[in-house]
Structure formats: C-alpha cells, structure tokens
C-alpha cells in the first residue's frame, strides 16, 4: 500500500475547520475490515484518530477530529480537524496498514489575520518641529508572529529607534506593539505595516502630523 499526502503545508485559519489530506490505493476486493488507519502527531506519536476492525474508533484528540467514512473504501483517509487552534500546529502522520503498511506526514500551519493597527502618539499635544515623539502601532489577535515595517511619508523605511514586542495571549494569538521614536519635522506622515508572513496579509496604520490637529 502506498500512502500519499499533500507536499505543501495545509494552512488553516484559527477557529475554522481544516482537512489533512491522505490517500491510499486499495486493491481490488478491498474491504474496510482489512483497514488499520492511524493519524498521530509526528513529533510525539500521540494518537489523534484511528479506524480499526472495520470501525471508526473516534477521536483521541480533544474530540475535534473526524474521518470521511463514506470515502474510506475508495482510499480517502483524510482527517477533518474542527475549530483549529494554535496548539494544533505541527506535523501529522497518516499510517495505513492493510496487508503491508506505509505512512506519510503532512504539516498543518495555523494562521490568524492581524487587526487594523491603532496608532497612538506621546506626547499628543503642543507638538513642535524638533520635538522627540513616540508613535505606537498596535495590532491584535494574529498568528504567527508578525513582521513590522515603518515608513515615512515618502515611503522611506524607518529602521532606527524602533522597538517591537509581541505577546501571546491565552489562545496563543499575538498582540503586536511597535514603538517608533522620531524627531518631528515641519510635518510628516508615519505609517506602520503589520504583515502576517503566512497569510501574506498586510495591515496598515498611519498618523499624519501637520502642526495641529493630528490626523490618524
């Protein structure tokens, strides 16, 4: 028996369902009573789901997995993972045993888009050219860790005096806070771009300082 899985990682958004594809080629006369199917975490061998003795043995993994029972006899051993969490990320091995056996691993990459950044300024009044200001760009509930880029109004990257921190919450999602310290010119626009490297999703925020008032 030869097991086939997707070469590319499966990308799944947090709280959505994901399908980890796995297939095998049944011989003529194959019956489900002959099938021994195991899905397990590759790195720990923790059992996720199994089908043996002609019966779906069910989920051994937080009751969020399911097979496609009507398709098994055709060689479809794919696994449905419901309500994906950050902690589900990793490699899953599909192991098929009939007379002989084979296995293959598929990677699950979890992602969550970042919110539109909010911009804050400190100090936020009585600003004069030459003043040092701190601009904070905050974006929330994304995964995996973001890449943060700052630019001025002319699109020139600002790399000096940037401090970025990323903190995971109890669900494993990241809140990003990036701080730019800059000396004000006569006027100027400062924009922050928060990029999710897996989704290739960019979230933009900007602040324009034109004497008074400020625009966000």
């Amino acid at each position: 028996v030869e097991v086939q899985v997707s070469e590319d990682p499966v990308v799944a958004l947090v709280d959505t369902d994901a399908t980890l594809r796995c297939s095998f080629s049944p011989e003529p006369g194959f019956s489900l009573a002959q099938l021994n199917l195991i899905w397990q975490l590759t790195d720990t061998k923790q059992l996720v789901h199994s089908f043996t003795e002609g019966r779906d043995q069910g989920s051994a993994y937080s009751n969020r997995t399911a097979l496609f029972p009507d398709l098994l006899v055709q060689g479809n051993a794919s696994l449905r993972l419901q309500r994906v969490r950050v902690t589900d990320e990793g490699s899953y091995t599909c192991f098929v045993s009939i007379q002989d056996f084979d296995s293959a691993a598929v990677s699950l990459q979890v992602a969550a888009p970042y919110s539109k950044p909010s911009m804050t300024l400190e100090p936020n009044k009585d600003l004069r050219p030459g003043n040092m200001v701190t601009i904070t760009c905050s974006s929330y509930q994304g995964y995996p860790e973001a890449e943060v880029f700052w630019k001025d109004g002319q699109g020139v990257p600002l790399t000096g005096n940037v401090t970025t921190s990323q903190m995971a919450n109890e669900r494993g999602l990241f809140d990003v806070h990036s701080v730019l310290r800059v000396v004000l010119g006569a006027n100027g626009t400062y924009s922050c771009l928060v990029r999710n490297p897996v989704l290739q999703q960019d979230a933009h925020g900007s602040v324009t300082i034109t004497g008074q008032p400020l625009t966000f």
């Epitope: 091995t93 007379q99 056996f101």
Partner: antibody
C-alpha cells in the same frame, strides 16, 4: 551497513551512576526515533526508554522514570542513556534499537552489560 | 507480568509447523504494528516479522498474522536452528510505551 554499537556498560555499586552510549552508522540517524531495551539475566525483553528524531519527545518505562535520562547528539550520530540511582534490578544487557516510522524496532545493537552489585 | 501475553514454551519436531500466539489490547496490537523478534542463545534480538511483513533475509518459512487484538507467528518446516526465544512487541499508545510479550522458548525435539 546499518549498525548500532553500544558501550559504557560496567560493574557499578547500588546508588551509583553510569552513562551508556550507542554509536549509529550506515543510516541517517537524525531521521529516526531510537530506543533502549534491556534484558535481565535469564529474563525477557523490557523496554526502557525512547526518544524522537529531534530529541524533543522522550518516553520512559515506569521502572526507570526519574532515574534514567535518554538523550541524543545528532551531530555525533550517538544515543545516550544516563542512569542514576542504580539498583540491583537494573542489572541487565542494554540494547539500543532503531525505531522506524512504522513503529518497528528494526535494527538492534549487540548490547552492553550493566551489573549493579556491591 | 507482561502487557502482551505469550505462551512460555512451544515445541515441535523437524519439518513440523508450530504457531506462537500473542494477545494484547486495542491500544497496542489492536491498532499498532505487531513485531516478532527471534533471539538465538547469547545474541541480540532480530526482527522476524512486522504484522505479516518479513524483512529481506528472513526465510518464508516464517509468517505472521494479526486479527483484532491478537497476533500469531507461524513457522513451517521447523529446523533445529529455529530453536530460540521468540518475543512479540508493539507500541502502546495508552501507556506511551513499548510493550513486550514474556517470550516463548521454542524447542525443536
């Protein structure tokens, strides 16, 4: 040729420590889980410990938990078993075995003898 | 007491067929590969059969089968050099441990 060669076994007093090594050759060591299995004189085979290919996951038999530590150095193609607080009942031939993707210990070393006695 | 249950001994005359049984549970043999090892006196165990698959170099006189939570090893055309200890083993995903049978001593009469 695929080979596993254990070393480090010796006579040690109860309460003492010992580190066993297993040198692997002839295969991509870093791609395989590995195990230690022991056999007391005149007795059957008893699994001791296992470790994932990267070393991130480790498992132990209840009889050695908290006393033995399995580790590996993939750059040296070597598996280790650090044995502390040794007891007379740890006296055995210790084998290292390759543990493949199909849950088969398919290659075994020739074994190294550990004797715990005062 | 072993998690997998094997008879302690078995015997047969040259040319005969003998079988050795191994009984386990749903968390080991029931869904995991069952392996059979031959250990000749004074030597390391050698893999003989996995489920019903023989590694290259193992004579086809040896065969394995598995049904439910039990497995068996059959040896046909018994030879004197088959006199050895035979062990079944499987990964147990409830215990997170390898489990072995107690071993069966095969005597060729």
């Amino acid at each position: 040729e695929v080979q596993l060669l254990e070393s480090g076994g010796s006579l040690v007093q109860p309460g003492g420590s010992l580190r066993l090594s297993c040198a692997a050759s002839g295969f991509t060591f870093s791609s395989y889980w590995m195990s230690w299995v022991r056999q007391a004189p005149g007795k059957g085979l008893e699994w001791v410990s296992g470790i994932s290919s990267s070393g991130s996951a480790t498992y132990y038999a209840d009889s050695v938990k908290g006393r033995f530590t399995i580790s590996r150095d993939n750059s040296k193609n070597t598996l280790y078993l650090q044995m502390n607080s040794l007891r007379a009942e740890d006296t055995a031939v210790y084998y290292c075995a390759r543990w493949n993707d199909y849950d088969i210990m398919d290659v075994w070393g020739q074994g190294t003898t550990v004797t715990v006695s005062s | 007491q072993s998690v997998l249950t094997q008879p302690p001994s078995a015997s047969g005359t040259p040319g005969q067929r003998v079988t050795i049984s191994c009984s386990g549970s749903s968390s080991n043999i029931g869904r995991r590969t069952v392996n059979w090892y031959q250990q000749l006196p004074g030597t390391a165990p050698k893999l003989l059969i996995s489920n019903s698959q023989r590694p290259s170099g193992v004579p086809d006189r040896f065969s394995g089968s598995k049904s439910g939570t039990s497995a068996s090893l059959a040896i046909t055309g018994l030879q004197s050099e088959d006199e050895a200890d035979y062990y079944c083993a499987s990964w147990d995903d409830s215990l997170n441990a390898w489990v072995f049978g107690g071993g069966t001593k095969l005597t060729v009469l």
